[in-house]
């Protein structure tokens, strides 16, 4: 039986939240999990290791608060459930070119039909290179 | 059958790129994977979770751009393939003692004979303590 | 047979080291592993992926050195073994509100009765939201 696994990479035509992902070209993996409108859709209940990295950068630092969230949505809960989150404030010297990453990864018990997404606070500050910004999971 | 797994730790006599790793002493693991001259060599095609952490520090901050890459080399591609990368710019206050880590981890489909390496931009700024700087993988 | 897995989240009534964790409510997982006085207790020898994230923040930056350690204690060693560690120095602009995360994750060969803990240098600077600060592992 095929391993349930996904590794999606940054897609620069993301225009709004949640982030959209490259699911076809490059170092992408998608097996036994569905990708739909920015989300990974679980089709088998179980334990999953879920991870994401986002690469933020800018030409001139103004220390806008940055956040990076992996959240879950399903029909049983009226609200999104934030599974993992990273926040950064006061992280660079005003006016300078800057760059910083946020990495998240943990184990969760996911249910068939759960949808997982990634959110960031400042879309314009995200660099979408495939090696720098990604989102993935695998079933234990 | 033995699990294919590796956890290598920092080796302070690294003098050039890619980084060299401790493969024998301390909290090192190496099973079903070969370590050869800085690289982890895959001997069974499949899905692997690959990770690395690098600890950068310095006595007096000058905000040199830092990069940390996990890359792959094999006979199918003429060029190295950067699998994961972290970059930092404008991350400390000029003149101060500073310290910062970069963590990378994700799932990849690797092929027998692929070799994986870690590169950093500023070797002199890396601290090689076994708990701080490491490189590993395991087959799912 | 049940998968050996744990995902514990931040507990704001931690008053001393090692950190204490929420092991009952929210997005917590605990199966085939025991939680005891801040520690995860291994009950089956084998390979484990161990991870932790800590979210540090403060109202007014004074660049106190921050450290985040995952360490192991057992009856065979007189001293704690630091498995993974992250350190930060000179990471924010003096006087400003700031926030930063540290993430650690790697594979270790653990033995039945090993106790795993998380330590931080500045307890008062840790935010214990369940999505921000956590500690987990799973048996490969």
């Amino acid at each position: 039986e095929l391993r349930k696994v996904a590794h999606l990479t940054g897609k620069s035509n993301s225009r709004s939240m949640p982030l959209e992902w490259e699911d076809t070209y490059g170092i992408v993996l998608l097996s036994g999990v569905k990708y739909k409108k920015g989300g990974l859709v679980i089709n088998e209940t179980g334990l999953y290791f879920v991870y994401s990295k986002v690469y933020f950068r800018g030409q001139s630092c103004n220390n806008l608060p940055l956040s990076h969230k992996v959240y879950m949505r399903n029909s049983k809960y009226p609200q999104d459930l934030v599974m993992m989150e990273g926040k950064m404030m006061s992280y660079c010297t005003t006016g300078q070119m800057w760059a910083r990453s946020s990495y998240l990864g943990a184990v969760f018990n996911l249910t068939s039909a759960d949808h997982l997404y990634v959110n960031v606070s400042e879309l314009s500050l995200v660099n979408f290179e495939e090696s720098q910004t990604f989102f993935g999971l695998y079933k234990l | 059958e033995l699990r294919k797994v590796a956890h290598l730790t920092g080796k302070s006599n690294s003098r050039s790129m890619p980084l060299e790793w401790e493969d024998t002493y301390g909290i090192v693991l190496l099973s079903g994977v070969k370590y050869k001259k800085g690289g982890l060599v895959i001997n069974e095609t499949g899905l692997y979770f690959v990770y690395s952490k690098v600890y950068f520090r310095g006595q007096s901050c000058n905000n040199l751009p830092l990069s940390h890459k996990v890359y792959m080399r094999n006979s199918k591609y003429p060029q190295d393939l950067v699998m994961m990368e972290g970059k930092m710019m404008s991350y400390c206050t000029t003149g101060q003692m500073w310290a910062r880590s970069s963590y990378l981890g994700a799932v990849f489909n690797l092929t027998s004979a692929d070799h994986l390496y870690v590169n950093v931009s500023e070797l002199s700024l890396v601290n090689f303590e076994e708990s701080q700087t490491f490189f590993g993988l395991y087959k799912l | 047979e049940l998968r050996k897995v744990a995902h514990l989240t931040g507990k704001s009534n931690s008053r001393s080291m090692p950190l204490e964790w929420e092991d009952t409510y929210g997005i917590v997982l605990l199966s085939g592993v025991k939680y005891k006085k801040g520690g995860l207790v291994i009950n089956e020898t084998g390979l484990y992926f161990v991870y932790s994230k800590v979210y540090f923040r403060g109202q007014s930056c004074n660049n106190l050195p921050l450290s985040h350690k995952v360490y192991m204690r057992n009856s065979k060693y007189p001293q704690d073994l630091v498995m993974m560690e992250g350190k930060m120095m000179s990471y924010c602009t003096t006087g400003q509100m700031w926030a930063r995360s540290s993430y650690l994750g790697a594979v270790f060969n653990l033995t039945s009765a090993d106790h795993l803990y998380v330590n931080v240098s500045e307890l008062s600077l840790v935010n214990f939201e369940e999505s921000q600060t956590f500690f987990g592992l799973y048996k490969l």
Epitope: - | S16, L19, E20, K37, G38, G39, N74, S112, A113, Y117 | -
Partner: antibody, heavy 118, light 109 residues
């Protein structure tokens, strides 16, 4: 124990060629790499590529990537395929064994001459 | 990775000593992954020294290797006529990359 190269020839520019290295009296052992080194007439030695006999991982000189392909079809044979040959590839091609953990080209073949000329 | 043998040719009398230098553009693997070879016309090279200073089997102790990191030396003492040949250094680097020096001809007078 010996190595012997074969397949050297006089070929025209743009042609392709496959060189063979055959081990006699032993088979490639664990922990060793099989390599190809060349030497242009009156010039020095130039490393081309190696193959790890444990897992067939291949290692190339940066200039050799793309046009040269090393492979191991059996436990006693290593091949070197060369494409788009030019006059600059004219050389004696040696195969040699080295320890995988350090450079020590212990056993060498006598070499095979490749001449590229129109 | 570039290995430079500064002298293309050196000469000495029978019974004398010659020193050949080899400089690497970057540190070799483990600071000692360097070997030395002797090559005579129309013959393949012969291994003399590996891991900077270890003598290959069957090689006389008149051949001595030293050095670490980026600077290495081959010293041949008690020169014999038969030592007339070209000598090459070879370095091993991380990522299993190898390089040869340009060679130094030893002329025994």
């Amino acid at each position: 124990q010996s190595l012997e190269e074969s397949g050297g020839d006089l070929v025209k520019p743009g042609a392709s060629l496959t060189l063979t290295c055959t081990a006699s009296g032993f088979s490639f052992s664990s922990g060793y790499d099989m390599c190809w080194v060349r030497q242009a007439p009156g010039k020095g030695l130039e490393w081309i590529a190696c193959i790890d006999t444990d897992n067939d991982a291949t290692y190339y000189a940066s200039w050799a990537k793309g046009r040269f392909t090393i492979s191991k079809p059996s436990s006693t044979t290593v091949l070197l395929q060369i494409t788009s040959l030019t006059a600059a590839d004219t050389a004696t091609y040696f195969c040699a064994t080295t320890h995988g953990d350090y450079v020590a080209f212990k056993l060498w073949g006598p070499g095979t001459l490749v001449t590229v000329s129109s | 990775q570039v290995l430079t043998q500064t002298a293309s040719s050196v000469s000495a009398a029978v019974g004398g000593t010659v020193t050949i230098n080899c400089q690497s553009s970057q540190s070799v693997y483990k600071n000692n992954d360097l070997s030395w070879y002797q090559q005579k016309p129309r013959q393949p090279p012969k291994l003399l020294i590996y891991q900077a200073s270890k003598l290959a089997s069957g090689v006389p102790s008149r051949f001595k290797g030293s050095g670490s990191g980026t600077q290495f030396t081959l010293t041949i003492g008690d020169l014999e006529c038969d030592d007339g040949a070209t000598y090459y250094c070879a370095g091993g680097y991380t990522a299993s990359i190898y390089a040869f020096g340009g060679g130094t001809e030893v002329v025994v007078k």
